[in-house]
């Protein structure tokens, strides 16, 4: 299973649920669904209030039980370490895969933290981060922001990923904007 890590804004916008949580239990495999279940302790929710309704406490995260079908494997054994988890809701359960955005909270830049807590949501409705995988590439629309990190270095470590968000400048136009300058 291979996938290009998304821009964190794309991960935020395409996910049903975005939370901060600690992985606290030993993974279990359900003998009916063949999904692996990790026990988590949620500390913050950034997206998904409406989707979850009253059941706003997520206690488990589910993933395929085999690597080759994009199952997520949690490598950290530190149960006090917080992770940003962006996943999909299926039948009220939080599902993630290898392709999901799951990252230690402490590894995120201050700008990314700001994005997840406040700013990325502003760009979800109108704006699209458009990956540029090879030169030449051109904008398909004024609401697209060309994401060129992959051309230069690892996509999740690039400047645009760590410091910028694709946000509306005016109706029908989105541009890269610094998250640094918006940090209080």
């Amino acid at each position: 299973c291979t996938c290009v890590p998304p821009h964190p804004q794309t991960a935020f916008c395409n996910s049903d649920l975005v939370i901060r949580a600690k992985f606290v239990g030993t993974p279990e495999v359900n003998q009916t669904t063949l999904y692996q279940r990790y026990e988590i302790k949620m500390t913050k929710m950034y997206k998904g209030f409406q989707a979850l309704g009253d059941a706003a406490d997520i206690r488990f995260v589910y993933t395929p039980a085999m690597e080759s079908v994009c199952g997520y494997f949690h490598r950290s054994h530190n149960r006090s370490e917080e992770f940003l988890i962006a996943g999909k809701l299926q039948d009220g359960l939080l599902h993630i895969t290898t392709c999901s955005f799951v990252a230690p909270w402490n590894s995120l830049s201050l700008a990314q933290r700001r994005g997840f807590t406040k700013t990325y949501t502003v760009g979800c409705e109108e704006c699209t981060v458009f990956p540029c995988l090879s030169i030449p590439c051109k904008l398909q629309s004024g609401t697209h922001c060309l994401w060129t990190d992959q051309l230069l270095q690892g996509s999740e470590k690039g400047f645009q990923s760590r410091h910028l968000a694709c946000l509306p400048r005016e109706p029908g136009l989105c541009t890269w904007q610094s998250l640094r300058s918006q940090i209080a």
Partner: antibody, heavy 113, light 111 residues
Amino acid sequence: QVQLVESGGGLVQPGGSLRLSCAASGFTFSSYAMSWVRQAPGKGLEWVSAISGSGGSTYYADSVKGRFTISRDNSKNTLYLQMNSLRAEDTAVYYCARFLDIWGQGTLVTVSS
Amino acid sequence: DIALTQPASVSGSPGQSITISCTGTSSDVGGYNYVSWYQQHPGKAPKLMIYDVSNRPSGVSNRFSGSKSGNTASLTISGLQAEDEADYYCQSYDFRRFSVFGGGTKLTVLG
């Protein structure tokens, strides 16, 4: 009581196809994941494939990926293994198992010219 | 494919206790509490003896017990009987390969 009965084994030429069936009884079939495990003559056990209770998730060993397809019909309480592009090394007794706890008696597949 | 490592054979006299080891890695035996043990008599299907490291299915004698330490699981048979003579296989969940078996151990009951 819980019972699994395999069928469909036999002699097939290299490159040929075969479809194994496993009829289940004595338990709520759709509530259990099912597996196929094989055992070459005089050798140990090798997991082949697994499928979730709903049939929505399927897993395969690297040695059979792209050649074998596991499926199930919960209305008929039956598990299947479609085997294509068979090779001599696929020769084995094939067991169906209820998530590896209850096993059938096995069906012999021989791949030879 | 590298299987879990078991001794090829073990033997013991009636009434004795024997232990069969099953060594894996942190991504299979060591990483999960999903180790099973199967008994297989010649020409027969495998029979589950132990699941989830140390649990016995109903109907299995309490002479059979399982344990795990680190990356190694063990099956102990106490009060060895002639009918215990068979092949024994360990099996573990493995995130990369889903399910992996040991190479099998032939248990011989002497005398």
